[in-house]
Interface confidence: low
């Protein structure tokens, strides 16, 4: 019925699914048959497939709808041509003529859009002992309107990082610590400079690689160790060591030794495996009192770190396998017998 629907001006943020134009064609063939049914196709001016045409089969009305977001930056003006045709082929010798084609001009107006990050999540990996001021990563975003972007960090709860507002480079500004939690997650904000100051948010994940910075220690509280006095035979006890470093490919391999030479007459320590060792008495002639045995534990790391731990061992007279003391004689009675 109409071959030129003129200009249609829309904002680039017009909702997907919106009907933007109604078109009407007529067919002289018998109603409600394949011969009179009309289908509409956009044949020119929409290579991105942003538009589509739905047809009402009862009225042959066509509804031009938005299928994909419009974009001022890539297509501000589009000359759209569509064709009305029957689903059944025309009889031999009959051709579609100019009245079967129509057009309209789609003018898209600019809407200020937020900057767009090149990734949803940016990841970087550094050793936890990097020098303060080291560049640990960078992020990039672009503004659809070409405005300058200012970067900032959000959620840097440990105060470890700084971002260069212009380049998006991220630097360490404090000592990093893998044991405090890795990866360390912060948000990166890209904000337009000027305009309406729209912003977008992405994630920056800093994976901290472990360095050997935690000395070995006892895996648990070993207070309350005791032997029944007098010893009838040399005794022993087992203890476990640990540290807070990451052991990715194998468990820790600690070595154990007595922490002072003077202990060697009374005690010996022998390794059971990488984490456990046995402390044994060398004789049975111990006084009825508490002995504090110092153990040196080396983690064999790079650099090797050493911890000196103390195991308090009490020799006490026992009743039915438990330490016995007259009331008031000793507080903190040990509870673990050997």
């Amino acid at each position: 019925e109409k071959s030129d629907y003129g200009n249609l001006t829309l904002a680039e943020d017009t909702n997907i699914g919106s009907t933007i134009l109604t078109i009407q064609a007529t067919d002289a063939d018998e109603p409600f048959t394949g011969s009179s049914k009309i289908l509409y196709h956009i044949i020119k001016g929409d290579s991105e497939g942003r538009l589509g045409v739905d047809t009402d089969p009862h009225t042959n009305t066509g509804y031009v709808i938005i299928k994909k977001p419009l974009d001022f930056e890539t297509a501000a003006v589009s000359n759209i041509v569509f064709k009305a045709e029957n689903p059944e082929p025309l009889v031999f010798g009959v051709k579609y003529n100019a009245s079967s084609f129509a057009k309209f001009t789609l003018i898209v107006t600019d809407v200020n859009e937020a900057p767009q990050f090149s990734q949803h999540v940016f990841q970087a990996k550094v050793s936890e002992d990097v020098a303060i001021g080291t560049k640990v990563g960078n992020v990039t975003a672009k503004d659809p309107e070409g405005l300058d972007i200012s970067y900032s960090l959000r959620g840097d709860t440990r105060g470890w990082l700084k971002i260069d507002h212009v380049t998006g480079e991220i630097f360490s500004v404090a000592p990093l610590d893998r044991e405090a939690g890795s990866p360390y997650r912060v948000q990166v904000v890209a904000t337009e400079v000027g305009g309406s100051s729209l912003s977008s948010v992405s994630e920056f994940h800093l994976i901290l690689m472990d360095v050997n910075d935690n000395p070995p220690r006892l895996a648990k509280d070993y207070t309350g160790l005791f032997f029944c006095h007098p010893l009838s035979a040399p005794g022993s006890l087992i203890f476990e060591a640990t540290d807070d470093d990451q052991h990715l490919f194998r468990g820790p391999h600690f070595t154990f030794s007595l922490g002072s030479g003077s202990l060697q007459n009374d005690w010996e320590v022998s390794k059971i495996n990488g984490t456990h060792a046995r402390l044994s008495t060398r004789h049975t002639e111990f006084e009825e009192r508490e002995y504090v045995v110092l153990i040196r534990i080396n983690d064999g790391g790079r650099p090797p770190l050493e911890g000196i731990v103390s195991l308090p061992v009490t020799f006490c007279s026992c009743v039915e396998g438990s330490c016995f003391r007259p009331a008031g004689h000793q507080t903190g009675i040990p509870t673990v017998g050997m």
Partner: antibody
């Protein structure tokens, strides 16, 4: 030699805005990693960190005072400024500026005394 | 906020003494602790950073130790110029916070 010197009004009245200036020498606030903080100390009491400005103009504030504080800098004149709005007698204190580098306040100014009194 | 507590507000010691000033944090601070000295005239100086590192120009009689939440500053051989108030300060989390101070006096 790094030095910092604070200056302020000395005395002002409640509800007024306190403006402080920190003038420094021996370093540049355009150097990566540099920053200057403001710290205050009410008479006979402990130290309270107020605000910090980084070399790239990024800022950090103590949340308990954030709504009243504005820190800024003039890199070319080697100065850092602090404004505190709506002052009260509780804001009477000695105000220090200090250079913060590598997570430490390694050099401090001598402080400037501020009294809020009606 | 992380609270820094110096339980001893004042301390009296004799010249030559070994003095230890303690400081505790309300939560673990990963050794992110500095110590400052404030002289009676108000002058403030950095002594120790990162728990145990001696700042340049500070006499070796000052030392720091600790981990987790409990830290201490030790002066091994007290001298007259050490009369001051000593503050610990954490930088594990913002806001940066100081202890209440320990005033050191001569007996």
């Amino acid at each position: 030699q790094v030095t910092l010197k604070e200056s302020g009004p000395g005395i002002l009245q409640p509800s007024q805005t306190l403006s402080l200036t920190c003038s420094f020498s021996g370093f540049s606030l355009s150097t990566s990693g540099m920053g200057v903080s403001w710290i205050r100390q009410p008479s006979g009491k402990g130290l309270e960190w107020l605000a910090h400005i980084f070399w790239d103009d990024d800022k950090r504030y103590n949340p308990s005072l954030k709504s009243r504080l504005t820190i800024s800098k003039d890199t070319s004149r080697n100065q850092v400024f602090l404004k505190i709005t709506s002052v009260d007698t509780a804001d009477s204190a000695t105000y220090y500026c200090a250079r913060r580098v590598l997570s430490t306040f390694d050099v401090w100014g001598a402080g400037t005394s501020v009294t809020v009194s009606s | 906020d992380i609270q820094m507590t110096q339980t001893t507000s004042s301390l009296s010691a004799s010249l030559g003494d070994r003095v230890t000033i303690s400081c505790s944090a309300s939560q673990g601070i990963n050794n992110y602790l500095n110590w400052y000295q404030q002289k009676p005239d108000g002058t403030v100086k950095l002594l120790i950073y990162y728990t145990s590192s001696l700042h340049s120009g500070v006499p070796s009689r000052f030392s720091g130790s600790g981990s987790g939440t409990d830290f201490s500053l030790t002066i091994s051989n007290l001298e007259p110029e050490d009369i001051a108030t000593y503050y610990c300060q954490q930088y594990s989390k913002l806001p940066l916070t100081f202890g209440g101070g320990t005033k050191l006096e001569i007996k």
